[in-house]
């Protein structure tokens, strides 16, 4: 019968020619009259057989990540006779891994997008590379993931590439983050190779800021022929916030006269002081009122950013009119 | 890493000039409004003025208004504070700091989160 | 012009709880920013928007903001807290701030 071992080879040996093993037939006592013939794919061009002594040898650089066994059949023949001594026998060569891949992340470009304010431990995006190298052969293609920028804002779990919020963010500080996230193979040890990403995680606004009045006075005149509906001027509140977050209503606080109100005009987040009744000059020539200004809609969870309404004080002068 | 260095200072007679410059590194300067707060010694923090990130808006504490001028060229990362017509009470550690938050933010909300070291004028005869 | 008053000390025992108040009219309607100084150095932030804290800030400081007055509040207080604290807040265009107050740590 034939007699031989598992056949290894390393790949990208840079040897001319590289001993794998020696196949045999039980049969041969060594006198040379036995030849071993090697056939099948590879064989003569990348493997070739001692004729007389069955031993193989690789005789080109291999690469695992290209063709990890090659199939190859052996026959030995009695020089005397010409004969078969063994049924022809197939047999396995395995490339053997060495690490020669780094990691590499396919899914590149990463984006994220995560709310302001999120707290500690909000998954944020898994990013996940993968190695060429062979899986079951040592630490070849065991992964490690690091972060090289993006603290102290973010942490990336080590086995899974799965990246996480440390500490919170404001959007109105700084909108968007670059993340540099390195994988090393070989479990971090020496030896190994790495490959990097970068994420960039941008914040989505949520409603953290009150609308504030630019200015604590507005003075606005008002003619005493005004008629009632009148628009006699606007005032201006800003938010930081963007979209939805930054809708306000104004409305009157203070008016003991109860003579004007305010409308808010949705288009522009202005305020528009209206004339509820006509003024009289003679009767009262100024007006003192105070205005306020609110988010239009603030949840639960972030009323402790809006605990007190912005307001404004509003002098209004009345003009004369000559009468009749 | 991220920081403000204040130059310029000295001692200077009353009535006379001096220009502050502010230089920014590690950060996208253009991005940042920048204020000026002066403390004379042993006393609090008093606000002076701040440019706008664009340098589109300026404002001023009234002590100071009239008479120094902040500007800045993002060209070269700096700031600047020309003082004119000093007098003894101007005298202070000038420090130039940055105003949180991005650009479209308005208001000063979010503090001064970097400051520099500070640059000592003493105005005196 | 806007004002905000402060208290000019406060004392404090090691692990204990220190509050610095912050007056000024209406000061609940708009947001406080709180600077520390140490001798010698220049501020630093440690509470803005009444309630946030920046990065590197430790949660034992903390801030509120109601009515007329804003309340920095140290919990566990350390010898190294001991500095001058200031509130800032803005009126119209302009920055005001408090007139500071030492916090001294007692030995």
């Known amino acids: 019968g034939w007699v031989w071992n598992q056949f290894f080879v390393p790949e990208e040996m840079n040897t001319t020619s590289h001993h794998i093993g020696q196949l045999r037939s039980d049969l041969d006592n060594g006198n040379n009259s036995f030849q071993y013939k090697l056939l099948g794919a590879g064989a003569g061009s990348t493997f070739i057989i001692d004729e007389r002594t069955g031993d193989i040898y690789a005789i080109q650089k291999l690469d695992r990540e290209e063709r990890s066994l090659y199939i190859l059949r052996a026959q030995v023949i009695d020089i005397a006779t010409g004969r078969a001594v063994e049924p022809e026998s197939e047999f396995v060569i395995k490339v053997s891994d060495i690490n020669d891949n780094e990691p590499k992340f396919l899914d590149e470009p990463y984006e994220a997008i995560v709310p302001e304010m999120s707290p500690e431990g909000t998954l944020v995006i898994q990013v996940t590379a993968s190695d060429a190298d062979d899986p079951s052969s040592g630490n070849n293609a065991r992964l490690l993931y690091s972060l090289l920028q993006g603290q102290p804002y973010f942490s990336v779990e080590p086995t899974t590439g799965v990246i996480r919020i440390s500490s919170k963010m404001d959007r109105e500080l700084q909108d968007e983050y670059w993340v540099i996230i390195q994988a090393k193979d070989m479990i971090g040890q020496p030896g190994a190779l790495s490959g990097t990403t970068s994420v960039l995680i941008k914040l989505s606004d949520v409603n953290d800021n009150k609308p504030i009045f630019k200015e604590s006075l507005y003075r606005l005149t008002v003619s005493e022929s005004a008629p009632t509906g009148t628009s006699i001027g606007t005032i201006m509140a800003y938010d930081n916030d963007i979209g939805e977050n930054a809708e306000m209503d104004y409305s009157i606080e203070e008016d003991d006269s109860q003579t004007f109100d305010i409308i808010t005009n949705h288009e522009t987040q202005e305020g528009i002081v209206i004339l509820k009744k006509k003024v009289d000059f003679e009767h009262q020539n100024h007006y003192g009122i105070r205005a306020k200004v609110k988010n239009h809609h603030v949840p639960e969870q972030l009323m402790k950013y809006h605990t007190e309404a912005s307001t404004t004080f509003i002098k209004i002068q009345v003009e004369d009119v000559d009468e009749p | 890493q991220v920081q403000l260095v204040e130059s310029g200072g000295g001692v200077v007679q009353p009535g006379r000039s001096l220009r502050l410059s502010c230089a920014a590194s590690?950060?996208?300067?253009?991005?940042?409004?920048i204020h000026w707060v002066r403390q004379a010694p042993g006393k609090g923090l008093e606000w002076v003025a701040v440019?706008?990130?664009?340098?589109?808006?300026?404002y001023y504490a009234d002590s100071v208004k009239g008479r120094f001028t902040i500007s800045r060229d993002n060209s070269k990362n700096t700031l600047y504070l020309q003082m004119n017509s000093l007098r003894a009470e101007d005298s202070a550690v000038y420090y130039c700091?940055?105003?949180?938050?991005?650009?479209?933010?308005?208001?000063?909300?979010?503090?001064?989160?970097?400051w520099g070291q500070g640059t000592t004028v003493t105005v005196s005869s | 012009s806007y004002e905000l008053t402060q208290p000019p000390s406060v004392s404090v025992s090691p692990g204990q709880t220190a509050s610095i108040t912050c007056s000024g009219d209406?000061?609940?309607?708009?947001?406080v920013s709180w600077y520390q100084q140490k001798p010698g150095q220049s501020p630093i932030l440690v509470i803005y928007?009444?309630?946030k804290w920046p990065s590197g800030i430790p949660e034992r400081f903390s801030g509120s903001n109601s009515g007329n007055t804003a309340t920095l509040t140290i919990s566990g207080t350390q010898a190294m807290d001991e500095a001058d604290y200031y509130c800032?807040?803005?009126?119209?265009?302009?920055?005001?701030f408090g007139g500071g107050t030492k916090l001294t740590v007692l030995s």
């Open positions: 700091a940055r105003r949180a938050g991005i650009p479209g933010t308005t208001g000063y909300y979010y503090g001064m989160d970097v």
């Open positions: 928007q009444d309630n």
């Open positions: 590690g950060f996208t300067f253009s991005r940042y409004g």
């Open positions: 440019i706008w990130y664009d340098g589109s808006n300026k």
């Open positions: 209406r000061l609940g309607e708009k947001y």
């Open positions: 800032q807040a803005w009126d119209s265009s302009t920055v005001v």
